[in-house]
């Protein structure tokens, strides 16, 4: 039962995480205009991975895509690549993990196959989460570097008379969404890997019971162990399935809380 719950929870957490990574990648607010010196501005700038936007006091918002590919900073390209790799791996991981879920029966799929698929999806989620965290961190580092560079020459005066105020950018909402989402995907992946560890040995123990008629098998056959690992009767399996579903429902209440925060 614990394994199923862990697997189900890992799946849901990863699902939320990947949804968050996709959201962060699409968001325009990766960097936002720093308002420290001017908390109330009539023109507010913010930038994403794909376009930059300007919101005027009038409410008019204008966004322009980065239509060049070669003219973009290498770091931005790297961040884009990391986020896309994260999404692709996460999506494949989700697909694999759906079939790996214990509560889903697909033909006569062996539990060892499910264990392998759980491990595979877990690793994919871990790598996906790491890609997202890396991408967001690289962008954040780029922002910090640019921030201090623009602070150093904040005002480039012409004869001290005319001032050109350089726009400084600070962390946007997408960075925090990305970090949290990456973390959730990572946690989900770890949970899947833990669930896999629970799946694999019990399968071996179950086969051992089939093949050995000696007293050895009795030593490996305590009911408590079998019940806890979910290999009892059909009724026990049904209960585990319900438990898993209940856990998933509980986890599904998290996104609303997360969105609210």
């Amino acid at each position: 039962m614990a394994v199923t719950a862990c697997q189900g929870l890992g799946f849901v957490v990863s699902l939320i995480g990947i949804a968050g990574i996709i959201a962060a990648t699409c968001m325009d607010q990766w960097s936002t205009q720093d308002l420290y010196n001017n908390p109330v501005t009539a023109v507010f700038n913010y930038q994403g991975l794909w376009r930059s936007c300007v919101r005027e006091s009038s409410g008019f918002t204008e966004c322009r895509g980065y239509f060049t590919l070669l003219g973009l900073p290498a770091m931005l390209q790297a961040v884009r690549a990391l986020m896309i790799v994260g999404i692709v791996l996460g999506a494949i991981g989700l697909l694999v993990s759906i079939f790996a879920l214990k509560c889903i029966r697909i033909g006569s799929m062996e539990d060892s196959a499910k264990a392998n698929m759980t491990l595979t999806s877990g690793i994919m989620f871990i790598v996906s989460g790491l890609c997202a965290i890396a991408g967001v961190s690289v962008f954040a580092n780029m922002l910090v570097t640019n921030f201090w560079m623009s602070t150093a020459n904040m005002y480039t005066g012409m004869g001290g008379m005319v001032q050109t105020v350089q726009t400084r950018y600070t962390f946007g909402a997408a960075l925090f969404v990305g970090w949290v989402a990456g973390g959730l995907t990572l946690i989900g992946g770890v949970m899947m890997c833990i669930a896999c560890r629970g799946l694999a040995p019990e399968e071996t123990n179950y086969k051992a019971v089939s093949y050995h008629a000696s007293g050895h098998s009795v030593a490996y056959k305590p009911g408590g162990f079998k019940a806890s690992t979910g290999f009892g009767s059909n009724t026990k399996n049904k209960k585990i399935y319900d438990g898993g579903a209940r856990t998933e429902d509980e986890v599904q209440s998290y996104p609303s809380k997360h969105d609210y925060v």
Epitope: V54, S58, G59, T164
Partner: antibody, heavy 118, light 113 residues
Amino acid sequence: QVQLVQSGAEVKKPGASVKVSCKASGYTFTSYVINWVKQKTGQGLEWIGEIHPRGGNTYYSEKFRGRATLTADKSISTAYMELSSLRSEDTAVYFCAILRRGNAMDYWDQGTTVTVSS
Amino acid sequence: DIVMTQSPSSLAVSLGEMATINCKSSQSLLNSGNQRNYLTWYQQKPGQPPKLLIYWASTRESGVPDRFSGSGSGTDFTLTISSLQAEDVAVYYCQNSYNYPYTFGQGTKLERK
């Protein structure tokens, strides 16, 4: 079409307050920011402040902060500008205008003349 | 606050001739995010409210005759009337639309010679 209609001329005594209204029609009132501008006779334009009717956010020129209060009543699509502690130098025409693309004021009303005299 | 300085304060031009009004700001009005200059030009005739002519330094408002054009970037801007018409006699104002408080130039009075 978009139209702004202001209240009539006002004559006030020094120290009193005046509340000028600006009724909007021809568009969704909460869609556009309303700005207030002062113009003394034969002189230039002076920005007082702006109000965002949707959320009620207001921004004021430092010169008018504390004396001018901008409000909006969404139910009757009307913006108000109240100026307190009136002085003789407040004698002017007060305009309300809609802020549009480019933060440009592209619809103006005819203005309300406020005269402060003892 | 951004200070807007217009020159000349008054200008007399013959009908059909070109009129040029300059406006200088104490700070750049160029927004790096969209590479637009937040400078607006208005025309005001006696007894009337101002009328929007040009925004973003060079974008003509719809309905404004094409003899009116705006140019410039950063801190120096120009309003040009290519061929003065009798109805163009008015006071012209430039305005900083970039930062609070929005500030206006002192105005340029355009008269016919």
